[in-house]
Amino acid sequence: GCINITSSASQEGTRLNLICTVWHKKEEAEGFVVFLCKDRSGDCSPETSLKQLRLKRDPGIDGVGEISSQLMFTISQVTPLHSGTYQCCARSQKSGIRLQGHFFSILFTETGNYTVTGLKQRQHLEFSHNEGTLS
């Protein structure tokens, strides 16, 4: 089966959610860790990450189809200090598989707004900080 990782972002009011989604088979969940790094070109690991999620096998899920697991990192108010390059990664202690998502960036602008770039084309986001709306 194919295991992959995707990055996405969403906004709720002033909150920015950075989401790392790993697609995997049910039996592959055990021993998998998903993590989000910032400004780490080569040494992105669970130890150097901003947040990590250790996956557990869910006995309640039937079948052997592909399932997704999500790590969500929520920033309550994006500030200039959040500017930088982010990356979703995952690795399996069992199989040794390492996944690295595309780099994406948060850029805080002089006008007090911020943009999230580097996601899939339809997920290029531009946020107005003060109104908290998707522009």
């Epitope: 309550s76 500030t79 500017s83």
Partner: antibody, heavy 119, light 107 residues
């Protein structure tokens, strides 16, 4: 356990310089933005400066711009505050603080370093 | 720059009393944080993002508010709650601002 230990405070004459250091331990220092917050004797809290996790971007309150410089050395887990052209109104306890990543609260505070500017 | 005005400046409360400290912002803000500081000690985050209690804070404390008006409430005042409380917010471009503090004393 997160620990922030400030050093370098003391008595200095107006117009002179002083450099504060803050040694950090117990967390991945290079992941976190850092700041200095000060408190004049018997007065309230005042944000002084902040520095991006990578050190590239710095931000200052207007009254210290051009006189104070915040910096960091991620290899040494240390942040600094270089204070030049000191004035009597800079007299305060200077706290080394961490920025919470998911919120705009300052979550860990050092014990503070007293800086007295007087002739 | 957004100015935070705390009231009262000082107050005295009896054990068991309900205490409310308010923080008014000169313009609307998204969140308010509160810190507790005791004499000779560093400030501690007490309530963050308006209503979330920091780790180890007793549940007699609560926070509420929106826009320009925020408050910290203690439901049953205890001797250990005597301290100075500061509100704080973030806004661009002035960045971080604090209120002048409210000194809470026990009768």
């Amino acid at each position: 356990e997160v620990k922030l230990v400030e050093s370098g405070g003391g008595l200095v004459q107006p117009g002179r310089s002083l450099k504060l250091s803050c040694a950090a331990s117990g967390f991945t220092f290079s992941n976190y933005a850092m700041a200095w917050v000060r408190q004049a004797p018997t007065k309230g809290l005042e944000w002084v400066a902040s520095i991006h996790s990578g050190g590239g971007n710095t931000y200052y309150r207007d009254s210290v711009k051009g006189r104070f410089t915040i910096s960091r050395d991620n290899a040494k887990n240390t942040q600094y505050l270089q204070m030049d052209s000191l004035r009597s109104e800079d007299t305060a306890t200077y706290y080394c603080v961490t920025h919470n990543y998911e919120s705009t609260v300052f979550d860990y505070w050092g014990q503070g370093a007293m800086v007295t500017v007087s002739s | 720059e957004i100015v935070l005005t705390q009231s009262p400046t000082t107050m005295t409360a009896s054990p068991g009393e309900k205490v409310t400290i308010t923080c008014r912002a000169s313009s609307s803000v998204s969140y308010m944080h509160w810190y507790q500081q005791k004499p000779g000690a560093s400030p501690k985050p007490w309530i963050y993002e308006t209503s979330k209690l920091a780790s180890g804070v007793p549940d007699r404390f609560s926070g509420s508010g929106s826009g320009t008006s925020y408050s910290l409430t203690i439901n049953n005042m205890e001797a250990e709650d005597a301290a100075t409380y500061y509100c704080q917010q973030w806004n661009y471009p002035s960045m971080y601002t604090f209120g002048a503090g409210t000194k809470l004393e026990i009768k």
